[in-house]
């Protein structure tokens, strides 16, 4: 025979094709071996031009012999060489779907590989590459968007070989709340990490507002919208700079009387403060707090006590913000003047959280009467709100 | 309207016991803190007990610490004032005050008093 | 404790005469000073909170000034239903305590 080639080569398979001897023959006698593989032979009919080859081993180089035979004679042997295809990892699955994450799992091929290609698209055509090693068989996809159809796709790599493509389809879940409307809906939706975040005044996604929510205070899910911490920031500022906020969210900052009215104007909120000096620490929490818009001059109600620092915040119930430019306190002095800060003060304060940092006078300082009294500025404050039925909402999220 | 009514005040020997109640109305109870403060005979006002909205938190002067104890029912809208170990020096003109809004705040409103008289 | 001096501790004034009635307290207390008045057989009535606030329903004759340590009540013009014994009170800290009163009477 002559003219042996092979094709249709699969990871298992291939088909071998010659041209037959130009004398009539009884059969031809087929072998084929390859490294680590031994050789198997296979007599076939003089008619046949073809043959298949299954049972391979993948991502190996056999070589293939035929000869042709009749009676006793046999004709000289011609011989190829082939390749077969790397072949697949299998099962490919999507498992612990969340609205962002979900984590692949698969199996190796038989063949040993170099590494796989990742590749996952979703159907708006956004897609990722990644290549993993030779030892991973699950990889955890991250920064996936909620309420997605996603298509994963993994290939085995050996140097230049590559494998046929697998693939699985899976959905993201959707996110609770798209649009958190604070930092409890952020954590419902999965946001378990301290730090910025995007929430949406009542949901709009118009009414975008980048806010600081500690995950980790008490459950977590708070908005802050205080910061001491250092001085670096001048909390001695006008009604303008305090009805719109100020400084670096990350740091020290107010969020601003605007955004607090629209917070708690959203539902019913908690107050919490927690305190920091020298190694102790105190908080308190209100489980009913507002502010009311600026017709009411930022009217505070706090309401509810428990903690450890003390119930500083009572005498400020029900008092209008004070700035040294606009006094609603209710002292013939103006409060935020001689105090260098601005509150809810009455006359004046036994909370001034925006105080001087750092000063030990009398009342100047970032003062917290029931803890420190009103010589003693504490080193580190935050005041934080959220729902007062997250414990609620926790739960439920937790039983679905 | 707003209204405080003292009762249980009486002649009671030395080192006896007794409990003063007052009766709270027209106002929401559990929002406020309350206080007892105290007239001897012909005297100026001292204080005598403070206790929070809850209950939760009770303050004492010094002249009675360790003997009066303060307390409150919310359901009942009752705020109470047991006395023991009573001495000569306690007898006084015992009234009930309520608080502008804090612990520590002006007295806004006040009952008519009851008097307690300590003597053998 | 905070100590609360009052003084004069008597004062007789005719009707219609001006009336000031001084409070010093023993450390600063911001503006948490609270001004009462006694009637013979009678609680007490809030007339003054946070040093300068009137009560509600109390006439404006009744005013109160100062800050720190040093307090004022004054009566701008004595009526005869004025006459009664004013006490004024610290709620700054526990223990609250009172000034031992000045008694405004009829000269």
């Known amino acids: 025979p002559s003219g042996l080639v092979t094709a249709n080569i699969t990871d298992s398979e291939a088909l071998a094709r010659w041209q037959p001897a130009i004398a009539t023959v009884d059969s031809y006698v087929i072998s084929y071996t390859g490294e680590k593989v031994p050789e198997i032979t296979r007599t076939v009919s003089g008619n046949t031009v073809e043959y298949a080859l299954t049972d391979l081993e993948p991502a190996t180089e056999y070589t293939l012999r035929i000869f042709a035979e009749k009676g006793p004679q046999k004709s000289s042997t011609i011989t190829a060489k082939f390749t077969t295809d790397l072949d697949s990892p299998r099962d490919l699955t999507a498992t612990e779907v969340q609205s962002e994450t979900a984590l692949l799992t698969w199996r190796p091929p038989r063949a040993s590989v170099t590494g796989y290609l990742l590749v996952y698209e979703s159907v708006d055509g956004t897609v990722k590459e990644v290549i993993v090693g030779p030892d991973t068989t699950s990889y955890s996809l991250a920064d996936l968007s909620p309420s997605t159809h996603y298509t994963a796709k993994i290939q085995a790599l050996n140097g230049p070989l590559r494998s046929n493509m697998i693939q699985t389809i899976f959905t993201t879940i959707g996110l609770l709340y798209p649009f958190p409307k604070d930092c409890s809906q952020a954590m419902l939706n999965g946001d378990t990490t301290s730090g910025l975040y995007t929430i949406y005044l009542n949901g709009d996604k118009a009414e975008a507002l980048e806010v600081f929510c500690d995950m980790t205070s008490d459950g977590g899910g708070w908005i802050v919208f205080l910061r001491r911490k250092n001085g670096r920031e001048n909390f001695y500022q006008n009604w303008k700079a305090y009805a719109a906020g100020f400084g670096d969210r990350r740091e020290e900052f107010w969020l601003g009387l605007d955004n607090l009215n629209k917070i708690t104007a959203q539902g019913q909120y908690e107050l919490r403060v927690d305190l920091r000096d020298h190694g102790e620490t105190a908080f308190a929490v209100y489980d009913k707090f507002s502010v009311g818009d600026a017709k009411t001059r930022y009217k505070l109600k706090v309401e509810g006590y428990s903690g450890t620092a003390g119930d500083s915040m009572a005498y400020h119930n029900g008092r209008s913000f004070s700035t040294f430019d606009k006094d609603t306190d209710s002292a013939i002095t103006n409060c935020a003047l001689s105090y260098k800060g601005a509150f809810w003060y009455r006359n004046c304060h036994r909370v001034n959280l925006m105080g001087r940092y750092g000063d030990n006078n009398h009342s100047q300082g970032v003062n917290w009467f029931h803890w420190k009294g009103h010589e003693h500025s504490i080193q580190f404050a935050e005041m934080k709100l959220r729902p007062s039925n997250f414990r609620n909402l926790e739960g439920r999220r937790k039983r679905a | 309207q707003v209204q405080l009514v003292e009762s249980g005040g009486g002649l009671v020997q030395p080192g006896r016991s007794l409990r003063l109640s007052c009766a709270a109305s027209?106002?929401?109870?559990?929002?406020?803190?309350m206080h007892w403060v105290r007239q001897a005979p012909g005297k100026g006002l001292e204080w005598v007990s403070g206790?929070?909205?809850?209950?939760?938190?009770?303050y004492y002067a010094d002249s009675v610490k360790g003997r009066f104890t303060i307390s409150r029912d919310n359901a009942k809208n009752s705020l109470y004032l047991q006395m023991n170990s009573l001495r000569a020096e306690d007898t006084a003109l015992y009234y009930c005050?309520?608080?502008?809004?804090?612990?520590?705040?002006?007295?806004?409103?006040w009952g008519q008093g009851t008097m307690v008289t300590v003597s053998s | 404790d905070i100590q609360m001096t009052q003084s004069p501790a008597s004062l007789p004034t005719p009707v219609g005469d001006r009336v000031t009635i001084t409070c010093r307290a023993s450390?600063?207390?911001?503006?948490?000073l609270n001004w009462y008045q006694q009637k013979p057989g009678k609680a007490p009535k809030l007339l003054i909170y946070?040093?300068?606030n009137l009560e509600t329903g109390v006439p404006s004759r009744f005013s109160g000034s100062g800050s720190g340590t040093d307090f004022t009540l004054t009566i701008s013009s004595l009526q005869p239903e004025d006459f009664a014994t004013y006490y004024c009170?610290?709620?700054?800290?526990?223990?609250?305590?009172f000034g031992q009163g000045t008694k405004v009477d009829i000269k």
């Open positions: 206790i929070s909205g809850s209950g939760g938190s009770t």
């Open positions: 946070d040093a300068s």
């Open positions: 450390q600063y207390i911001q503006g948490f």
């Open positions: 005050a309520k608080v502008m809004s804090s612990m520590e705040d002006a007295f806004d409103i």
């Open positions: 009170q610290q709620s700054y800290s526990t223990p609250q305590t």
């Open positions: 027209g106002f929401t109870f559990d929002d406020y803190a």
